[in-house]
Interface confidence: low
Amino acid sequence: GCLTQLYENAFFRGGDVASMYTPNAQYCQMRCTFHPRCLLFSFLPASSINDMEKRFGCFLKDSVTGTLPKVHRTGAVSGHSLKQCGHQISACHRDIYKGVDMRGVNFNVSKVSSVEECQKRCTSNIRCQFFSYATQTFHKAEYRNNCLLKYSPGGTPTAIKVLSNVESGFSLKPCALSEIGCHMNIFQHLAFSDVDVARVLTPDAFVCRTICTYHPNCLFFTFYTNVWKIESQRNVCLLKTSESGTPSSSTPQENTISGYSLLTCKRTLPEPCHSKIYPGVDFGGEELNVTFVKGVNVCQETCTKMIRCQFFTYSLLPEDCKEEKCKCFLRLSMDGSPTRIAYGTQGSSGYSLRLCNTGDNSVCTTKTSTRIVGGTNSSWGEWPWQVSLQVKLTAQRHLCGGSLIGHQWVLTAAHCFDGLPLQDVWRIYSGILNLSDITKDTPFSQIKEIIIHQNYKVSEGNHDIALIKLQAPLNYTEFQKPICLPSKGDTSTIYTNCWVTGWGFSKEKGEIQNILQKVNIPLVTNEECQKRYQDYKITQRMVCAGYKEGGKDACKGDSGGPLVCKHNGMWRLVGITSWGEGCARREQPGVYTKVAEYMDWILEKTQSSDGKAQMQSPA
């Protein structure tokens, strides 16, 4: 469980796994929390010790039993890691330390008027980890108002000295306050050059990216996939840095994936944990415990509850199972990552969720912010489930929209594939706002499988629904995450706040829009809709939306995209843009495939393809 108490005048004896200098016990505790093996820490404030070398010493400790003997030491502060402490887990540290000089590599000096401005400069500099500021009363006039930006190999000061009229602090990048902004894109088949600061094994590029984000010196990474040509390098995640802060070169390289640390992201950072479970994969490491449990999720929960457990493998080998329970191998390593990753096994592996700060990672997205004809421009992250389905033949163009409903699944309209069922011609772009931002270097997803509803017929409007299985799972970010699906046969909910989004035409004879458009449209009853479309059958598996006077509607190019409605603070995918008579015509509402009516089909297809449902469902 979560232990938050601090022990004054106490020092844990033994169990040392790392030591560093930190300005106070809280920062020491944070470093312990993020260290893969640290369970306990002891901190020596300047006042507690005469030995200059040990002043501000932060000692990170591990213990098989979860505790260590405490010895009395005046002024010392000891405590526990905040692993398992949910929302209290944060790498953000805002404090300013007066009368303290945190030493490191001084790589930038400038004159500023306040310590806050110095901290802001550090936060807006990609390499700055901490800073020192000489106040106006500093004893040497030429150094007054100097703001020194610093870094060190471990991200913590190389020494801390008591010095009058100096104030120090840390970058607020871990607080998601950087103005730099971050690169969310993952670059398939691209390897970055430059300095490797660390090497770990990870099951995918997204775990690699999260590790990079929380590594003090990682600015970008290259991940070598499990089909990389050199066996000994498979699943290697190389954490990298460079003097410029960006890769000095990149090389097209099959089966490599590169990307950037997300530490400079504004507003939100990824959680410092990895919630995904990897079927058919074994994680090797030091054995902590073996227990019989029922199911891989219980195995993950068991690992999460056992504080020293870092990752696990749930074995489905017949000899490892009895009755309904199978062996759950709880493991750890020096760096928190598996020491070996094996594929094609009868196990499923994953990580402890002890550093997750939201607790439940499977909840639906509940973001509250809110051409389409009559629409307005959307903003970044407003509709993070919206994808653009593009076809690349001689040229490339946007054809349809779609909705991300799982790591590896997109829901769209069947008619988008009329005449183009070839999986290799499609490119799926997620996490984008402007189509003009797409270049030849923009990463995209390729299709592993197109599943068109078995009853769909090209010439008819019925069953206009299709699932796309992506070749590789997508990571969730602020700009790329799934929309919740409705409950099966959801008919009782009255939706009053519904929106349609897409890059489609802004008028009937228009053109594809650059910026993702949004329009707020009311739902129309099927009876009312049937009156407007007397030549067509509006079935219970369709839903209509539109204004009586027209003027706002989905249009060509919006097909397959989402009709989402917000209910009880949660967005749900109510419809898939399907068809209509023209666009935004008076008394001609848009017709959408009713997702709730296809929940059985969606679950059947995603489960049979995967053996496991991966949808975002409010249940």
């Epitope: 390897a191 050059s193 430059d194 300095v195 490797d196 600061v197 660390a198 090497r199 290259t222 040509k229 050199i230 066996e231 000994s232 390098q233 290697v236 190389l238 460079s242 003097e243 000095s248 070169s249 990149s250 090389t251 390289q253 099959e254 490599t256």
Partner: antibody, heavy 119, light 107 residues
Framework: EVQLLESGGGLVQPGGSLRLSCAAS????????MLWVRQAPGKGLEWVSS????????MYADSVKGRFTISRDNSKNTLYLQMNSLRAEDTAVYYC????????????WGQGTLVTVSS | DIQMTQSPSSLSASVGDRVTITCRAS??????LNWYQQKPGKAPKLLIY???SLQSGVPSRFSGSGSGTDFTLTISSLQPEDFATYYC?????????FGGGTKVEIK
């Protein structure tokens, strides 16, 4: 200008040891994968060992595994090859070389240092 | 290990001749093939990387082609300074391996 200068070669008896050094200049040494390639008299080129920029990731040819150790000191811009349990068949000119990114093309080579293993 | 077989092992040619050297890999290596030139007593020099990309500073009379298992180095018009030994090298998988070399001599 990129320069790689090997040193440490010489005559050694079978079973003996030798440490080769390669001083690098003209580029940011710490950014590059480095390797050793050897060439026996009158023969072709044979890759010996590679080391990634951080020094934590090394690879060896089967013929030298367990006997040779590649290392680097990024602060000194120097690459090393510690050769133990030397055999007659290790006699060769040893080249230090720089690898350009993931394509593993060797874009710069040193002039080579001769190692002779003989009794 | 991937074996790289060069042919011919040696050839005689005159200045101005068009010279072709082939390199065959024991398994597909996509385009992960590099060509080097080595003169007696000197270190090798990179000519071509990724099967067909000309290294900076290398004369345009050198060209490379091929993909998969069969590759070719072509010297369109042999110059006196081109008499040397040429090696191919695969960088598809560990260990990186070199061809046995092709010695280009004056006829």
């Amino acid at each position: 200008e990129v320069q790689l200068l090997e040193s440490g070669g010489g005559l050694v008896q079978p079973g003996g040891s030798l440490r080769l050094s390669c001083a690098a200049s003209g580029f940011t040494f710490s950014y590059y994968t480095m390797l050793w390639v050897r060439q026996a008299p009158g023969k072709g080129l044979e890759w010996v060992s590679s080391i990634y920029p951080s020094g934590g990731f090394t690879m060896y040819a089967d013929s030298v595994k367990g006997r040779f150790t590649i290392s680097r000191d990024n602060s000194k811009n120097t690459l090393y090859l510690q050769m133990n349990s030397l055999r007659a068949e290790d006699t060769a000119v040893y080249y230090c070389a720089r690898v350009d990114t993931a394509m593993a093309m060797i874009d710069y080579w040193g002039q080579g240092t001769l190692v002779t293993v003989s009794s | 290990d991937i074996q790289m077989t060069q042919s011919p092992s040696s050839l005689s040619a005159s200045v101005g001749d068009r010279v072709t050297i082939t390199c065959r890999a024991s398994q597909s290596i996509s385009s992960y093939l590099n060509w080097y030139q080595q003169k007696p007593g000197k270190a090798p020099k990179l000519l071509i990387y990724a099967a067909s990309s000309l290294q900076s500073g290398v004369p345009s009379r050198f060209s490379g082609s091929g993909s998969g298992t069969d590759f070719t180095l072509t010297i369109s018009s042999l110059q006196p300074e081109d008499f040397a030994t040429y090696y191919c090298q695969q960088s598809y998988s560990t260990p990186i391996t070199f061809g046995g070399g092709t010695k280009v001599e004056i006829k």
